[in-house]
């Protein structure tokens, strides 16, 4: 599946995807989050704060087609993809440009869906088969959630709603991602 288009407004259009875009590859394996570091306790963050400026969980608009077997939605649907590193990130002086830069602080927070919405889509099928209707779950908003370690199982906890919203008015710094990584992120999902 190749890219059909790549827009500059953080909206990717990809043909014939299933119900969900996938989480970024770094979220795909819970083993990285199941290590019993620090005796199974989250590391101490001396600068842990709920200041919204320290979180970079952002919502990217993503347009895709919904598929079910050989059938494809007549129109693409638009939803959000949760992206960015969740804090508590420490704002540290940038020696080069006197600005600030983000330093992610490990896998203790994750930018994941907070709310979903349902949308009914009409799927067109080949070979004269009757159209199908499907109700799909679409990401409606994203949030930083804290990871706690619990019997070596990963568990996501809400982090205060004031830190949950993507930063308005701040241009997010895009992470360098290869086309291959993006492709892995956006494979068929249901």
């Amino acid at each position: 599946q190749g890219w059909q288009a790549f827009k500059n407004d953080a909206t990717e259009i990809i043909p014939e995807l299933g119900e969900y875009p996938e989480p970024p590859p770094e979220l795909e394996n819970n083993k990285t989050m199941n290590r019993a570091e620090n005796g199974g306790r989250p590391p101490h963050h001396p600068f842990e704060t709920k200041d919204v400026s320290e979180y970079s969980c952002r919502e990217l608009h993503f347009t895709r087609y919904v598929t079910d077997g050989p059938c494809r939605s007549a129109k693409p649907v638009t939803e959000l993809v949760c992206s960015g590193q969740c804090g508590p990130a420490r704002l540290l002086p940038n020696a080069i440009g006197r600005g600030k830069w983000w330093r992610p602080s490990g896998p203790d927070f994750r930018c994941i869906p907070d709310r979903y919405r349902a949308q009914r889509v009409q799927l067109l099928c080949p070979g004269g088969e009757a159209p199908r209707a499907r109700k799909v779950r679409l990401v409606a908003s994203c949030k930083c959630k804290r990871l706690t370690r619990f019997h070596n199982q990963s568990e996501l906890k809400d982090f205060g709603t004031e830190a949950a919203r993507p930063q308005k008015g701040r241009k997010p710094r895009p992470r360098a991602r290869s086309a291959k990584a993006n492709q892995a992120e956006l494979e068929n999902a249901y």
């Epitope: 979220l27 079910d68 994750r110 109700k135 959630k145 996501l156 494979e187 999902a189 249901y190």
Partner: antibody, heavy 116, light 111 residues
């Protein structure tokens, strides 16, 4: 073909812990939401927990704070860590694949008995 | 809590049609076409029979059909056969799309 195989059930005392596993094959595991559903002996189906493909987790009130759902996409395996078990948790536990907001494939189930 | 209510039992003779109802609050059945139906034989795992009110997965007989009126969804089985004898459960999801609820189940007896 799609297959879900649960394991890890058994006899445990009240207050004890147990971890269930569900090995999946025949589909792109990481792309699907997955649930645990249980059925007490002679009773109906009860939804327990679901995990999204992003790793977000949700629970029935009856198990919140005691059970933890997780997934390992590298192993195509779903887990349910059950702590502080009670007699009323005795049931057959099924893992089920969630596609388009319904459960299209189910495992054969694993029996958990909580008794002293 | 949201609840789905089903009759405890229904029965019918071979060749007849029967209908199993599933009644819920507007937030889980009435406002959204999201009811699915599962068949469960004794000692076996549930099997999806109907989803999104009236869609049949491939491999499920066209004798099974679903419908919805107001806040009541229904499963109709026509041309009843002995192998249809089983428990049937309706299911829906919560408004958040992140929780599910099952009806109490209906035992179908083929006389």
């Amino acid at each position: 073909q799609v297959q879900l195989v649960e394991s890890g059930g058994g006899l445990v005392q009240p207050g004890g812990s147990l971890r269930l596993s569900c090995a999946a094959s025949g589909f792109t595991f990481r792309s699907h939401w997955l649930s645990w559903v249980r059925q007490a002996p002679g009773k109906g189906l009860e939804w327990v927990s679901v995990i999204g493909n992003w790793g977000d987790t949700y629970y029935a009130d009856s198990v919140k704070g005691r059970f933890t759902i997780s997934r390992d996409n590298s192993k195509n395996t779903l887990y349910l860590q059950m702590n502080s078990l009670r007699a009323e948790d005795t049931a057959v536990y099924y893992c089920a694949r969630d596609t388009y907001l319904h459960f299209d494939y189910w495992g054969q189930g694993t029996l958990v008995t909580v008794s002293s | 809590d949201i609840a789905l209510t089903q009759p405890a039992s229904v029965s019918g003779s071979p060749g007849q049609s029967i209908t199993i109802s599933c009644t819920g609050t507007s937030s889980d059945v009435g406002d959204i076409n999201d009811v699915s139906w599962y068949q469960q034989h004794p000692g076996k795992a549930p099997k999806l029979m109907i989803y999104d009110v009236n869609n049949r997965p491939s491999g499920v007989s066209n004798r099974f059909s679903g419908s919805k009126s107001g806040n009541t969804a229904s499963l109709t089985i026509s041309g009843l056969q002995a192998e249809d004898e089983a428990d049937y459960y309706c299911s829906s999801y919560g408004e958040s799309l992140t929780s599910y609820v099952f009806g109490g189940g209906t035992k179908l007896t083929v006389l």
